[in-house]
Interface confidence: low
Amino acid sequence: MRTEAQVPALQPPEPGLEGAMGHRTLVLPWVLLTLCVTAGTPEVWVQVRMEATELSSFTIRCGFLGSGSISLVTVSWGGPNGAGGTTLAVLHPERGIRQWAPARQARWETQSSISLILEGSGASSPCANTTFCCKFASFPEGSWEACGSLPPSSDPGLSAPPTPAPILRADLAGILGVSGVLLFGCVYLLHLLRRHKHRPAPRLQPSRTSPQAPRARAWAPSQASQAALHVPYATINTSCRPATLDTAHPHGGPSWWASLPTHAAHRPQGPAAWASTPIPARGSFVSVENGLYAQAGERPPHTGPGLTLFPDPRGPRAMEGPLGVR
């Protein structure tokens, strides 16, 4: 049986919030609590953007904030993959990328983030309230999925700009000694809590847990903390899912040779426009699912030939070939 633990993702600060400094003393303990609980816990962020130039064109960007190695990324729409969602793209760090209409261009932006451009018209066109989900399978963390959609009132071409991440990427955390800072923060938090002992503590709501408890990990937060931070898994039902895709793949994956566009995919003409790794922008909602490999029945990542990183981000395929320069 698959074990799922719901963990809230950290949202970026809302731009233009006034009086934030005045509330710092109230906010600080909760920020520290969140950091203490989520320390070492992977996060997935999703950003959905509608292009101003083409109203039926969407850009989905997803990233994994974790220290593990990513073995597979699955992008779906209409709900989480395996729960009514339709697969749009599968990105494997060693073995390539598969995409299905209306996905136009799926690519790696960094070792831990991907982007996907969708375009379409009529039945295969995404619409404003479509839910897009990204699932990152990593080792040893397991599978983590996040979903996002455009905010209802969003203007074409506008989504919250990727905010510089207020939290450090987990793979850099160890290097930068964030663990020490968090430890200090946790101690400070305990100190604050002891000072405010006289205040009644908010009652914890029991969390929805699956029958099988998650396998314990050294950095796993306590049950109480998990309960305190638990958020329900949110998905948006949409009427925009393409019937053409649903009928094309009764077995879960579309018949890619039947549904793919015949024209060549448009390629970005340069390195990724987004240099920093953002966390979810406004208008995106995030939910995270964790399934350990042993429990989810997933494979550990394949270890193939030694991989090398290349200075030219476009690679040789910008001008030629399936094996070379396009």
């Epitope: 960094t110 030219d312 981000p313 476009r314 030629e320």
Partner: antibody
Framework: QVQLVQSGAEVKKPGASVKVSCKVS????????MHWVRQAPGKGLEWMGG????????IYAQKFQGRVTMTEDTSTDTAYMELSSLRSEDTAVYYC??????????????????WGKGTTVTVSS | DVVMTQSPLSLPVTPGEPASISCRSS???????????LDWYLQKPGQSPQLLIY???NRASGVPDRFSGSGSGTDFTLKISRVEAEDVGVYYC?????????FGGGTKLEIK
């Protein structure tokens, strides 16, 4: 570990078609980029075509354009290569091979790192 | 198409001795990112080909370190520092810079 299991030997008459299958195990087909390579008796290797993940399309070598069709059944994790209008010079061993992927990012470079055992196709009248 | 030419056609070697196979391409396989898009494969008798070297000089997983690839542009070499009996077979170079990828004619390594 990826494994590719190919269908058995075929004997065909000139003008007929042959469909060779390649079953993937250890991974799902959607995680791989499948290529097909053939080898005529006593001759070298010849790339016929393969899946191009950047386009999401299959690309065929010019020589086989119009005669070859490469398809996949994701429900059974099986890839197929169909060659039509067979001639005697199509007598060969046909291999399926997965295209390895070197590095993430916007970089797509392929090498055939896992091969099937091959399917012998004999075209004879 | 890029034409790949291998030499020698046949290479008899004594076990323990070194061996060298040459591969020449009709156009440069060096791309602006500094990589040479050339791979080496070995096809042992009665078997499928197996990847030995990719990107000119990178050994594939599980390949013994007695195999090494070198060269740049149009001239490439596969070296075996000490040939063993299990190394017999036909060695192919393949260019991966342009579509379609093309293979050399092969070099048959045999034990003396």
């Amino acid at each position: 570990q990826v494994q590719l299991v190919q269908s058995g030997a075929e004997v065909k008459k000139p003008g007929a078609s042959v469909k060779v299958s390649c079953k993937v195990s250890g991974y799902t087909l959607t995680e791989l980029s499948m290529h097909w390579v053939r080898q005529a008796p006593g001759k070298g290797l010849e790339w016929m075509g393969g899946f191009d993940p950047e386009d999401g399309e299959t690309i065929y070598a010019q020589k086989f354009q119009g005669r070859v069709t490469m398809t996949e059944d994701t429900s059974t994790d099986t890839a197929y290569m169909e060659l039509s209008s067979l001639r005697s010079e199509d007598t060969a061993v046909y291999y399926c091979a997965t295209g390895g992927y070197s590095s993430g990012f916007n970089y797509y470079y392929y090498y055939m790192d896992v091969w099937g055992k091959g399917t012998t196709v004999t075209v004879s009248s | 198409d890029v034409v790949m030419t291998q030499s020698p056609l046949s290479l008899p070697v004594t076990p323990g001795e070194p061996a060298s196979i040459s591969c020449r391409s009709s156009q440069s396989l060096l791309y602006r990112n500094g990589n040479n898009y050339l791979d080496w494969y070995l096809q042992k008798p009665g078997q499928s080909p197996q990847l030995l070297i990719y990107l000119g000089s990178n050994r594939a997983s599980g390949v013994p370190d007695r195999f090494s690839g070198s060269g740049s542009g149009t001239d490439f070499t596969l070296k075996i520092s000490r040939v063993e009996a299990e190394d017999v077979g036909v060695y192919y170079c393949m260019q991966a810079l342009q579509t379609p990828p093309t293979f050399g004619g092969g070099t048959k390594l045999e034990i003396k």
